[in-house]
């Protein structure tokens, strides 16, 4: 068997077979050593005793999107069935004190690989045996410790192959360069050690894209905005907005990268070479956002112009275009290529609470000598929208611990003035939280309070 | 002069619907909260239901949430409770009032009466 | 069962002072502002108090209302035949996000 009739059905075309090698694979047309690695079936009964006391699940994941030319990195990771768990020497243990279906167990091992290999191996005296070897034959890499790797994973996409030997986890980077755009298919086979020979345990598959485009991602951020997820911001408030570019191999760590952001309110283009911008809408509305992000990357040349054409034919020259030269690339050519990236949102402005101040402290006299408790009034004066709710949230001097937290439905006027009044425990300095809020927005100040003991001759005071 | 005049109350089946109306006039109808507020015959105050001005944030009492929706209309002045799987204890007599941390103001009220 | 409780009946001669409670918790009155209601027989409730212990225009000050950690008071001194009626205390509720009334008192003039 070949390794395409085992690992897949997705088969590329001859087309893709020849352009795009990536480096380090090998192509599938390989052949498959089916004794070491049997091949089943999907539905084969062989499955359920592939792994003992239970299936184990791959799972794979990637870093996709990934933009032409830079790194892509797969992740499989092996969940085992439960109570089970890989320790440092690469041996399948049973975690302590955990039950499963079958209880408690005795042995210690679900699969004790440091015991097989040390009286299973006939090698020779390079340390190679036969059977330590990955399904195209070639000799498992022999660094620190692949003794206590029992895993084998078979990567194969695009028509080409990858083996790996592993742990309970690996990553495998592969160079998007050659790759065709668009969403591609990775598909994983795992093996475990299995005395002489290999057992399959999981297959996983995972669609990947690769792409022309700079994968672009936007956050917004607002002082006093209630929710930042729902594109609706305030007038007359900085919105901050900050580019996130999808790039986890650093691709472009060296490019320029240029912004150019139209806010969609007539306040025309605005290029930058800072990630972040800060833009006011100073009327209510819907407005859309458009970003366009331009990158200098790394990426092919272009073939060199054709040799000018003589007038006359000349037969030494033989046929134009057989040159075999004339299209090829040189080497150690270090060109760019100018990459984009696009982000569109259309975002809601609308009025609300854009500020609010304590502007005055009162401590409430009590009709009773000597209370328990002091009353304090917070008089408030806020910007903006009219709140419909106030907070306040009382912690220990650090502003770290509450204590207290009380909502209530507040009715202000134009003015937007109003008057807080709040129960403090005993004498004490507090951290006072005041928010005002109403459906879009949630404004917040603070202050430190000094309550004093129950002296009437002691006055209340601002603490900062 | 503060006026809030309810409308819609009347006799009903369990399990139907009625939807109260309230008319405000003499103030910025816009810049205040409402609030629904009925009093079961011979029984005391019981709070129904409260809407901030812009209609964005509602709140309801445990009895009738889920049932009950309140609303209202900035540019008609009027305030909404829309009642439905009405229960024989919902009958009261349903007052309109502005505001909601406190009931400033209060309307004549409308009686509603749940009963087969 | 209502959240604040108020006595079912207070009772007065003209003249006198009559002080009704209302007693709650810190999720209500303890932290919010109380207000006091009055219903007069067949009509519709007033607002008597807000903030505690503030009277809207048009009460005379014969009410006022006091507050001391999660009680609240309505006092009525020189009372006339006319405070006859029902009185309620309410407030907002943090916890029960619910606005809470007392079961009402209801004040007897005697004489």
């Known amino acids: 068997k070949r390794f395409h009739d085992v690992l897949g059905n997705e088969r590329p075309s001859a087309y893709m077979r020849e352009h795009n090698q990536l480096n380090g694979w090998s192509s599938d047309e390989n052949d498959w050593n089916e004794k070491l690695y049997p091949v089943w079936k999907r539905g084969d009964m062989r499955w359920k005793n592939s792994w003992k006391g239970g299936r184990v699940q791959a799972v794979l994941t990637s870093d996709s999107p990934a933009l032409v030319g830079s790194n892509i990195t797969f992740a499989v990771n092996l969940i085992f069935p439960r109570c089970q768990k890989e320790d440092a020497n690469g041996n399948i243990v049973y975690e302590k004190n955990c039950r499963n279906e079958a209880g408690l167990s005795a042995d210690p091992y679900v699969y004790n690989w440091t015991a097989w290999s040390e009286d299973s191996d006939g090698e020779n005296g390079t340390g190679q045996s036969h059977h330590n070897v990955f399904p195209d034959g070639k000799p498992f890499p022999h660094h620190p410790g692949w003794r206590r790797w029992n895993f084998i994973y078979v990567f194969h996409t695009l028509g080409q192959y990858f083996q790996k030997l592993g742990r309970c986890s690996v990553r495998v980077s592969v160079n998007t360069a050659n790759v065709t755009l668009g969403p591609q298919l990775m598909e994983v086979t795992v093996y475990r050690r299995h005395g002489r020979a290999y057992v399959p345990i999981a297959q996983v598959k995972d669609v990947y894209v690769v792409t022309d485009q700079i994968p672009v991602f936007v956050t917004m951020f607002q002082k006093n905005d209630r929710n930042s997820s729902d594109e609706t911001f305030l007038k007359d408030l900085p919105i901050m907005f900050d580019v996130l570019i999808h790039d986890p191999s650093h691709f472009l760590n060296y490019s320029t990268i240029n912004y150019k952001w139209s806010f969609g309110d007539n306040t025309g283009l605005f290029v930058s070479t800072n990630h972040t911008v800060n833009h006011t809408y100073v009327l209510n509305g819907t407005f859309s956002l458009n970003l366009t992000v331009k990158a200098a990357a790394p990426g092919p040349c272009p073939p060199p112009p054709p040799p000018p054409r003589p007038s006359k034919p000349t037969p030494s020259l033989g046929p134009a275009g057989d040159n075999p030269l004339e299209l090829s690339r040189i080497p150690d050519e270090n060109c760019q290529i100018n990459r984009y990236g696009h982000f569109q949102a259309t975002i809601t402005i609308v009025e609300g609470i854009l500020e609010v101040n304590i502007i005055q402290m009162t401590d409430v006299l009590m009709p009773v000598p000597w209370p328990e408790s002091s009353l304090i009034d917070f008089v408030v004066t806020c910007q903006g929208s009219i709140p419909t709710e106030v907070c306040t949230i009382i912690s220990d001097p650090t502003c770290e611990i509450t204590q207290n937290t009380v909502c209530s439905p507040v009715d202000v006027d134009e003015m937007c003035l109003l008057t807080v009044r709040r129960t403090f425990n005993g004498s004490g300095t507090y951290c006072v939280n005041l928010t005002l809020g109403d459906d879009t927005s949630l404004a917040l100040t603070s202050t430190l309070i000094s309550v004093p003991d129950r002296d009437p001759a002691s006055p209340l005071r601002m603490a900062n | 002069e503060v006026q809030l005049l309810e409308s819609g109350g009347g006799l009903v089946q369990p399990g139907g619907s009625l939807r109260l109306s309230c008319a405000a006039s003499g103030f910025t109808f816009s810049n205040y909260a409402m609030s629904w507020v009925r009093q079961a015959p011979g029984k005391g105050l019981e709070w129904v239901s409260s809407i901030s001005h812009s209609g964005g944030s509602k709140y309801y009492a445990d009895s009738v949430k889920g049932r009950f929706t309140i609303s209202r209309d900035n540019s008609k002045n009027t305030l909404y409770l829309q009642m439905n799987s009405l229960r024989a204890e919902d009958t009261a007599v349903y007052y309109c009032a502005r505001k909601w941390s406190t009931f400033d103001y209060w309307g004549q009220g409308t009686l509603v009466t749940v009963s087969s | 069962q209502s959240v604040l409780t108020q006595p079912p009946s207070a009772s007065g001669t003209p003249g006198q002072r009559v002080t009704i409670s209302c007693s709650g918790s810190s999720s209500n009155i303890g932290n919010n502002y109380v207000s006091w209601y009055q219903q007069l027989p067949g009509t519709a409730p007033k607002l008597l108090i807000y903030?505690?212990?503030q009277r809207p225009s048009g009460v005379p000050d014969r009410f006022s209302g006091s507050k001391s950690g999660t009680s609240a008071s309505l006092a009525i001194s020189g009372l006339r035949s006319e405070d006859e009626a029902d009185y309620y205390c309410g407030a907002w509720d943090s916890s029960l996000n619910a606005y809470v009334f007392g079961g009402g008192t209801k004040l007897t003039v005697l004489g």
């Open positions: 903030a505690d212990s």
